[in-house]
Interface confidence: low
């Protein structure tokens, strides 16, 4: 679904696109377009991604620009003002609304922009499956600071009757040391399961700088989900995994 109207209220039913009027051809002069994107469920969040073909008049974003607000209108939390030829990073809302405002002046136009919107579930750009007998799992950007508003799923699949050993070389997530802090890891956290996320036995929830230590999984599947909030990023984590054939599987060789 593509929408190039100058402004609209969009209730997300499936992923779709909104564009500056006329995209990818030159946008119109003297436009002021406002889009309100709404998730169908009040507990859902929204993710928008800008098409790399992004072209708005540069000049310090004084004349042509697109603004993103985390909320129902311009009173929402300001997430950025964008122009030029470099597409903005993805934006994930904190609640069920994103408000987008596009302004153009009376001269100098570019191709404009296209935004894909969808319900934010998992972070596809940072989620990964691992099927090799050993490997390295790193948080996005490691060892640089990880991005905000992530939900990354890492799943290691190995043959049944094998044991997965996961060892962390580095671990630094935003701590939660204020009461009830270390109990809940309310800000950034890494969840680990022996099996699929939310299904297999929960191994633990981790944040701060205390490494999770050596993790063993005997189900043939080890899952990690890395969540980050909208502020304060740290270095993240790097972990090595290896697969041990169990004595049971040796018996069947």
């Amino acid at each position: 679904f593509r929408n190039d109207k100058c402004g609209d209220t969009i209730k997300i039913e499936s992923p779709g696109y909104l564009t500056s009027p006329g995209y990818p051809h030159s946008y119109h002069p003297s436009e002021k377009c406002e889009w309100l994107i709404q998730a169908p469920d009040p507990y859902q969040r929204i993710m928008i991604n800008f098409n790399p073909h992004f072209d708005l008049e540069d000049r310090d974003c004084k004349y042509d620009y697109v603004e993103v607000f985390d909320g129902e209108n311009e009173n929402g939390h300001f997430r950025g003002k964008f122009c030029g030829k470099i597409a903005p990073p993805p934006v994930v809302s904190s609640g069920p609304f994103l408000f987008i405002k596009f302004v153009s002046d009376y001269e100098t136009h570019g191709a404009g922009f296209s935004i894909r919107y969808e319900i934010f579930k998992r972070g596809p750009e940072c989620s990964q499956n691992y099927t090799t007998p050993s490997g390295v799992i790193k948080s996005p950007g490691f060892p640089e600071k990880y991005p905000n508003s992530l939900e990354c799923t890492y799943i290691v699949f190995v043959p049944k009757m094998s044991e997965i050993i996961l060892e962390f070389e580095s671990f630094d997530l935003e701590p939660d040391s204020n009461p009830p802090g270390g109990m809940f890891c309310r800000y950034d956290r890494l969840e680990i399961w022996d099996g699929f996320p939310d299904v297999g036995p929960h191994i633990g929830r981790y944040c701060g700088q205390k490494t999770p230590g050596r993790i063993r999984s005997s189900s043939g599947i080890l899952s990690m989900v890395f969540y980050t909030d909208s502020a304060i990023a740290k270095e993240g984590f790097s972990a090595n995994y290896s697969v041990l054939q169990s004595s049971v599987s040796e018996d069947f060789k």
Partner: antibody, heavy 115, light 107 residues
């Protein structure tokens, strides 16, 4: 299967001491914060104390300075050392695992403080 | 300290009824709100965490909603095994506090 088993309750005189234990099994004990919650006879639930997996400790104002929470990772056991007990400390004491909330509870152990 | 106020303190209902229990926090707690069920002589059991997430193994007739200061636990169709006392609890800050409880009795 997650299991929490409290012990150490009993009858004690005001001013006395008791040490409660909670033996944990069925999960990676070192990965979870743990808590004590109590319930006076016929009353509601009252949070007593918590210890994070990294060692932060938290106490209700009513027990601060008298109770000490601790954990022994090698024994998969949570403890509550209760000193200077008062009659108002009489309650069933539950240990609870802290996941997204108090997601698993023990069956409780009764502490009676009476002269 | 954050005070949690539950209402009603007790209610009578019949099997099949839709039951709603409310919980109000004395200040905003975002969605750090949990619901527990307790039967006489037993330990509490987690039903709902983070205001609206159903704990694994809990029947789907239980649901939670709300954010900020006002929260609701709903039992869509009351079953005989649901007669119990229900508590809300905030996990926003220490001291962690519980509501006074709502006893659901058979009419």
């Amino acid at each position: 299967e997650v299991q929490l088993l409290e012990s150490g309750g009993g009858l004690v005189k005001p001013g006395g001491s008791l040490r409660l234990s909670c033996a944990a099994s069925g999960f990676t004990f070192s990965s979870y914060a743990m808590s004590w919650v109590r319930q006076a006879p016929g009353k509601g639930l009252e949070w007593v104390s918590s210890i994070s997996r990294t060692g932060y400790t938290y106490y209700a104002e009513s027990v601060k300075g008298r109770f000490t929470i601790s954990r022994d990772e090698s024994k998969n056991t949570l403890y509550l050392q209760m000193n200077s007990l008062k009659t108002e400390d009489t309650a069933v004491y539950y240990c609870a695992r802290v996941g997204t909330a108090f997601d698993y509870w023990g069956q409780g152990t009764l502490v009676t403080v009476s002269s | 300290d954050i005070q949690m106020t539950q209402s009603p303190s007790s209610l009578s209902a019949s099997v099949g009824d839709r039951v709603t229990i409310t919980c109000r926090a004395s200040q905003s707690i975002s969605s750090y709100l949990n619901w527990y069920q307790q039967k006489p002589g037993k330990a509490p059991k987690l039903l709902i965490y983070a205001a609206s997430s159903l704990q694994s193994g809990v029947p789907s007739r239980f649901s939670g909603s709300g954010s900020g200061t006002d929260f609701t636990l709903t039992i869509s169709s009351l079953q005989p095994e649901d007669f119990a006392t229900y508590y809300c609890q905030q996990s926003y800050s220490t001291p962690l506090t519980f509501g006074g409880g709502t006893k659901v009795e058979i009419k």
